[in-house]
């Protein structure tokens, strides 16, 4: 059960990150042209 919940949490976090950064992989809160 704990393993299942951990897996569910991990997948949820990954989905959230993917939504945030978008399919292009560029996070609109961070600069990508220089190391700001």
């Amino acid at each position: 059960m704990k393993r299942f919940l951990f897996l569910l949490l991990t997948i949820s976090l990954l989905v959230m990150v993917q939504i945030q950064t978008g399919l292009s992989g560029q996070n609109d809160t961070s600069q990508t042209s220089s190391p700001s």
Epitope: D28, T29, S30, Q31, S33, S34, P35, S36
Partner: antibody, heavy 114, light 111 residues
């Protein structure tokens, strides 16, 4: 939608001063290092100055050709960046863009001529 | 200071044909965080510049997949698989690893 609007350009005599302004919207301005880049037929695109973040103590850096004459500043509360230009020379003539490089505006034109 | 050398300075192409632009930096653009800050910018006639590619190979939003960026260290390439009319203009490579330096530009024009 990202927008960068530069203003303040115009005609100035050699040795004179001018202040350029830029207002940004559509991206988290305070998270971005901001630059002024200029363009002339002679030199193409040329980086002029950069100002970093509050967390970098608003560190500033300049191209050798403008060091001691130009000053870059920012106001995160207004999403604005400025370029104070003193002791202007004919070779400072060009279109000035305020840009994080990720995004670009239309630029403002400075002409230094007598 | 880092110097960016672009070749060729002019590239005459036929619509539908491929195109390739080279950009070489005088020192490595690999930053201490493991990222390489090499961008490609296009300036269409009468317009302001617009970034197409960042971090060597990542396409900005809305950029067609006929554009490909590649390279590492000091040698970089921009390729267009099939040139379209809207691709004409001047292409600049610009490094962001140590302030910013632009290449001289490559004018993509019709043959």
């Amino acid at each position: 939608e990202v927008q960068l609007e530069e203003s303040g350009g115009g005609l100035v005599q050699p040795g004179g001063s001018m202040k350029l302004s830029c207002v940004a919207s559509g991206f988290p301005f305070s998270n971005y290092w901001m630059n002024w880049v200029r363009q002339s037929p002679e030199k193409g695109l040329e980086w002029v100055a950069q100002i970093r973040l509050k967390s970098n103590n608003y560190a500033t850096h300049y191209a050798e050709s403008v060091k001691g004459r130009f000053t870059i500043a920012r106001d995160d509360s207004k999403s604005s960046v400025y370029l104070q230009m003193n002791n202007l020379r004919a070779e400072d003539t060009g279109i000035y863009y305020c840009t994080p490089i990720d995004y670009w505006g239309q630029g403002t034109t400075l002409t230094v001529s007598s | 200071d880092i110097v960016m050398t672009q070749t060729p300075l002019t590239l005459s192409v036929t619509i539908g044909q491929p195109a390739s632009i080279s950009c070489k930096s005088s020192q490595s653009l690999l930053y201490s965080n493991g990222k390489t800050y090499l961008n490609w910018v296009l300036q269409r006639p009468g317009q302001s510049p617009k970034r197409l590619i960042y971090l060597v190979s990542k396409l900005d939003s809305g950029v067609p997949d006929r554009f490909t960026g590649s390279g590492s260290g000091t040698d970089f390439t921009l390729k267009i698989s099939r040139v379209e009319a809207e691709d004409l203009g001047v292409y600049y490579c610009v490094q962001g690893s140590h302030f910013h330096t632009f290449g001289a530009g490559t004018k993509l024009e019709l043959k």
